[in-house]
């Protein structure tokens, strides 16, 4: 299974629920389905409020039980770190896979941590982080913004990842804007 | 109790076709992935296939990926394993599994010519 | 392949304890809870001894226990008798490919 990991801020508008949470059971597989499901602590919730309605504690993150098909592991065994978590809604569980983004809460940036909070949303109706993989790439529309960090540094950790977001400048018009500059 | 009877064994030539059956009782069967594992003779023990309870997903060990063919029936409480194109080195007794632990007796297959 | 590791053999006299290690992995038995083991006498079919790491099945002596420890599950026999000389099998869910076996273990009461 592979993918080509998004940027956070294309994760983030992606997802129906965005959170930050701890890993604090072993996983258990459902027999039935062959999906396996990790036992979750929610510490923050960033996105996902409207979809759940009152069921706003989620416990559990499901995910398939097979590596073939997607399905995600959790490697780290210290139940006290936070991780940030963008999965979908389906029957109103939290389903994720190898492609979802899932990213130790310190391994982000102040700046990503920023848009995770409050930023990115600003950009989820309107502006479409558009994936630059191979020269010559060319804008589709005024309201895309180019990402070169895979074709420039090979990682998608790199700084437009780490530091921007693409938000509307005006009608019409999508830049890449620093995190930094927004309103802490 | 958990009863897992297999039945479709026999000889066979290489190259040849057989459909192995698992019978289970005592359980909820459509709760329960099901699989098959096989015991060469003197040797250990090899994972051959596996179906989730409600049939949609289906695994497969390299070994015999694209050769065979697991499904199940729930309303008969019973388990497949097509084996087509078989070799010489699928000889073996292939068990029937629940989960991750109950197994039948097993069934003999030969491949030879 | 064989992706749990056993050791070939182990012995003991009548009455005396011994464990058989089987050691695998952060996706095998070191994630999940999974685990079984299996008795096999020559010539018939495994008999689950113990599940899910340390459950006996009903019918099984008390005297084999299960545990687990980051990557190596165990299983204990104690108070080992003449029939319990046969070979086991560690076998443990596996995230990369379903289920995983370890290569056996022969059991030999002196």
């Known amino acids: 299974c592979t993918c080509v990991p998004p940027h956070p801020q294309t994760a983030f508008c992606n997802s129906d629920l965005v959170i930050r949470a701890k890993f604090v059971g072993t996983p258990e597989v459902n027999q039935t389905t062959l999906y396996q499901r990790y036992e979750i602590k929610m510490t923050k919730m960033y996105k996902g409020f409207q979809a759940l309605g009152d069921a706003a504690d989620i416990r559990f993150v499901y995910t398939p039980a097979m590596e073939s098909v997607c399905g995600y592991f959790h490697r780290s065994h210290n139940r006290s770190e936070e991780f940030l978590i963008a999965g979908k809604l389906q029957d109103g569980l939290l389903h994720i896979t190898t492609c979802s983004f899932v990213a130790p809460w310190n391994s982000l940036s102040l700046a990503q941590r920023r848009g995770f909070t409050k930023t990115y949303t600003v950009g989820c109706e309107e502006c479409t982080v558009f994936p630059c993989l191979s020269i010559p790439c060319k804008l589709q529309s005024g309201t895309h913004c180019l990402w070169t960090d895979q074709l420039l540094q090979g990682s998608e950790k790199g700084f437009q990842s780490r530091h921007l977001a693409c938000l509307p400048r005006e009608p019409g018009l999508c830049t890449w804007q620093s995190l930094r500059s927004q309103i802490a | 109790q958990v009863q897992l009877v297999e039945s479709g064994g026999g000889l066979v030539q290489p190259g040849g076709s057989l459909r192995l059956s698992c019978a289970a009782s005592?359980?909820?069967?459509?709760?329960?992935?099901m699989s098959w594992v096989r015991q060469a003779p003197g040797k250990g023990l090899e994972w051959v296939s596996a179906?989730?309870?409600?049939?949609?997903?289906?695994y497969y060990a390299d070994s015999v990926k694209g050769r065979f063919t697991i499904s199940r029936d729930n309303s008969k409480n019973t388990l497949y394993l097509q084996m087509n194109s078989l070799r010489a080195e699928d000889t073996a007794v292939y068990y029937c599994?629940?989960?991750?632990?109950?197994w039948g007796q097993g069934t003999l297959v030969t491949v030879s010519s | 392949d064989i992706a749990l590791t056993q050791p070939a053999s182990v012995s003991g006299s009548p009455g005396q304890s011994i464990t058989i290690s089987c050691t695998g992995t952060?996706?095998?038995?070191?994630?999940?809870?999974?685990v079984s083991w299996y008795q096999q006498h020559p010539g018939k079919a495994p008999k689950l001894m113990i599940y899910?790491?340390?459950n006996r099945p009903s019918g099984v002596s008390n005297r084999f226990s299960g545990s687990k420890s980051g990557n190596t599950a165990s299983l204990t026999i104690s108070g080992l008798q003449a029939e319990d000389e046969a070979d086991y099998y560690c076998?443990?869910?596996?995230?990369?490919?379903?289920?995983?076996f370890g290569g056996g273990t022969k059991l030999t009461v002196l």
């Open positions: 599994a629940r989960g991750f632990d109950y």
């Open positions: 899910d790491v340390s």
């Open positions: 179906i989730s309870g409600s049939g949609g997903s289906t």
């Open positions: 076998q443990s869910y596996d995230f990369k490919t379903y289920l995983v």
């Open positions: 952060s996706s095998d038995v070191g994630g999940y809870n999974y």
């Open positions: 005592g359980f909820t069967f459509s709760s329960y992935a």
